[in-house]
């Protein structure tokens, strides 16, 4: 059997670190057998069999010029084997970042904090952390570990499915190469990393007869669970074309009527989403949608009711541990005073 331990990586390759002493091992001889060493394709003897180093070649303070293929020969001139030297660095702790687009799953991505220059793989796992006692800050030995399944196509990402919203998790990402391993532990809670995808299907429509109004409507992001226990709230921004500043409102549901649009000008509108009880952060903005207020005349009859805004049927009870979430259904609301003023202005 070969006296050379096979490091993780392709066969026939041995590894070292720049600036350090490197030992190469002749694979096809018995441990301790004296051998001669040559660079592949070069007749010059690098180290003879009388070196006292047996089957090993020592390179002091290796640098990039030492990389390449080496040949070892036994005393009778037989080929002891060929060895390729590759230089690089041991792993440094990888950088890990986790995010959740919904309240049931989260994903973690990682990146090396230094490129080692060597074949590298990553081991990914997680534990669920549990708190000891209501008042205790101390955490119990956690449950797990379980593997965090990695994306199949080599993307540096793994996904935890079926996570618990109120639990804390410890993610372990270990970078492994032939010179060692290094681990990053990251504590995450779904509440803090939750960032929904932006709302979808944003539409902006004029309101016939109201030259200062636009109705915007949108839907939940497709990634948000279909029957949500946790609802989203929204932030809407709008601005007339060529106007640098956005106006911001927080609609109460899945639509909003803008009542101070600039007559005759197209307006850009975008929406963002966040967990209704402010867990995590706001989503990125949706792609902008455009609309121009109506230039037509007002209808003969002004409706007494209009679905100009939406609001929850139930107010969230922030002090309860698992608060009820509001209904998704819009609720009609009386026109407010501002609307009446606008109607008078239009009629005049």
């Amino acid at each position: 059997s070969s006296p050379c331990p096979q490091a993780w990586g392709p066969p026939g390759v041995q590894y070292g670190q720049p600036g350090r002493s490197v030992k190469l091992c002749c694979p096809g001889v018995t441990a301790g057998d004296p051998v001669s060493w040559f660079r592949d394709g070069e007749p010059k003897l690098l180290q003879g069999p009388d070196s006292g180093l047996g089957h090993e070649l020592v390179l002091a303070q290796a640098d990039s010029t030492d990389e390449g293929t080496y040949i070892c020969q036994t005393l009778d001139g037989a080929l002891g084997g060929t060895v390729t030297l590759q230089l690089g660095y041991p792993p440094a702790r990888p950088v890990v970042s986790c995010q959740a687009a919904d309240y049931e799953n989260f994903s973690c991505t990682w990146s090396p904090s230094q490129i080692s220059g060597l074949p590298t793989r990553y081991l990914t796992s997680y534990r669920k952390k549990t708190v000891l006692g209501a008042d205790s800050q101390r955490r119990s030995p956690s449950t797990g570990p379980w593997p965090c399944p990695q994306d199949p196509l080599g993307a540096a990402r793994c996904v935890v499915h079926g996570a618990e919203f109120w639990s804390q998790y410890r993610i372990n990402v270990t970078e492994v190469n032939p010179l060692g391993a290094s681990t990053r532990l990251l504590d995450v809670s779904l509440q803090s990393i939750l960032r929904p995808d932006p709302p979808q299907g944003l539409r902006v429509e004029s309101v016939p007869g109201y030259p200062r109004r636009l109705r915007a409507s949108w839907t939940y992001p497709a990634s948000w669970p279909c029957q949500p226990h946790f609802l989203l709230k929204f932030r809407l921004q709008y601005r007339p074309a060529q106007h640098p500043a956005w106006s911001t409102v927080e609609p109460a549901g899945l639509e909003e009527v803008i009542t101070d649009a600039v007559a005759g000008l197209p307006h850009a509108v975008r929406v963002s989403a966040r967990d209704f009880l402010d867990a995590g952060t706001w989503s990125t903005w949706s792609p902008e949608a455009w609309g121009t207020p109506s230039t037509g005349t007002i209808p003969k009859e002004i409706p007494a009711w209009g679905q100009l805004h939406t609001q929850p049927e139930v107010e969230p009870q922030v002090d309860s541990p698992a608060p009820p979430r509001p209904s998704l259904q819009p609720h009609p609301r009386l026109l407010d005073h501002r609307d009446s003023v606008e109607q008078v202005a239009v009629l005049a």
Partner: antibody, heavy 118, light 107 residues
Framework: EVQLLESGGGLVQPGGSLRLSCAAS????????MGWVRQAPGKGLEWVSS????????IYADSVKGRFTISRDNSKNTLYLQMNSLRAEDTAVYYC???????????WGQGTLVTVSS | DIQMTQSPSSLSASVGDRVTITCQAS??????LNWYLHKPGKAPKLLIY???NLQTGVPSRFSGSGSGTDFTFTITSLQPEDFGTYYC?????????FGPGTTVDIK
């Protein structure tokens, strides 16, 4: 020899923007994590932001999150810090730093002064 | 985020004196701790990494020890070029943080 040279500092009004650059030499820039650290007048050192070798993950101090953006151009061996919505408390000397073997900020530039004042 | 505290905040010492600075982390940072010397108008210089390892080229009169939350930095015989502000810094987390600094000046 590792060399880091910051530029782009200067006087800017509150709410304004500035982009700092850090030109790196003496090492293979694309292999290393890089970052920015600042020191306000009469104060201590404060880590600002870091970026992995590929640029794929960026990390920010809470004090600058949403206002500052770190980026890098590995083909130009240059690190950047785009600073928007600047405030008086962002006034500081900004240092570019290199991480090595997982050790944060082993090598530093000489710094560039950013003054935010009306 | 992890808070770092340092003591003393300043000290006066003479050339040849033994100087000790302590640094405490608000939670366990294993040995992910650096010590720097910063002089006005200059770049900070890394002296000690991983709590106790001497950075290449740094004189052996500097040393560091500790793990977990409590760390110590020592200069066995203070030299004229050692005056300045010393900072500890944790890098256990992805959000590194510095101690407030210890200014060492001439007595």
């Amino acid at each position: 020899e590792v060399q880091l040279l910051e530029s782009g500092g200067g006087l800017v009004q509150p709410g304004g923007s500035l982009r700092l650059s850090c030109a790196a030499s003496g090492f293979t820039f694309s292999r290393y994590m890089m970052g920015w650290v600042r020191q306000a007048p009469g104060k201590g050192l404060e880590w600002v932001s870091s970026i992995v070798p590929s640029g794929g993950i960026t990390i920010y101090a809470d004090s600058v999150k949403g206002r500052f953006t770190i980026s890098r151009d590995n083909s130009k061996n240059t690190l950047y810090l785009q600073m928007n919505s600047l405030r008086a408390e962002d006034t500081a000397v900004y240092y570019c730093a290199r991480d090595h073997m997982g050790i944060v900020a082993t090598d530093w530039g000489q710094g560039t002064l950013v003054t935010v004042s009306s | 985020d992890i808070q770092m505290t340092q003591s003393p905040s300043s000290l006066s010492a003479s050339v040849g004196d033994r100087v000790t600075i302590t640094c405490q982390a608000s939670q366990d940072i294993t040995n992910y701790l650096n010590w720097y010397l910063h002089k006005p108008g200059k770049a900070p210089k890394l002296l000690i990494y991983d709590a106790s390892n001497l950075q290449t080229g740094v004189p052996s009169r500097f040393s560091g020890s500790g793990s977990g939350t409590d760390f110590t930095f020592t200069i066995t015989s203070l030299q004229p070029e050692d005056f300045g502000t010393y900072y500890c810094q944790q890098y256990d987390t992805l959000h590194p943080s510095f101690g407030p600094g210890t200014t060492v000046d001439i007595k």
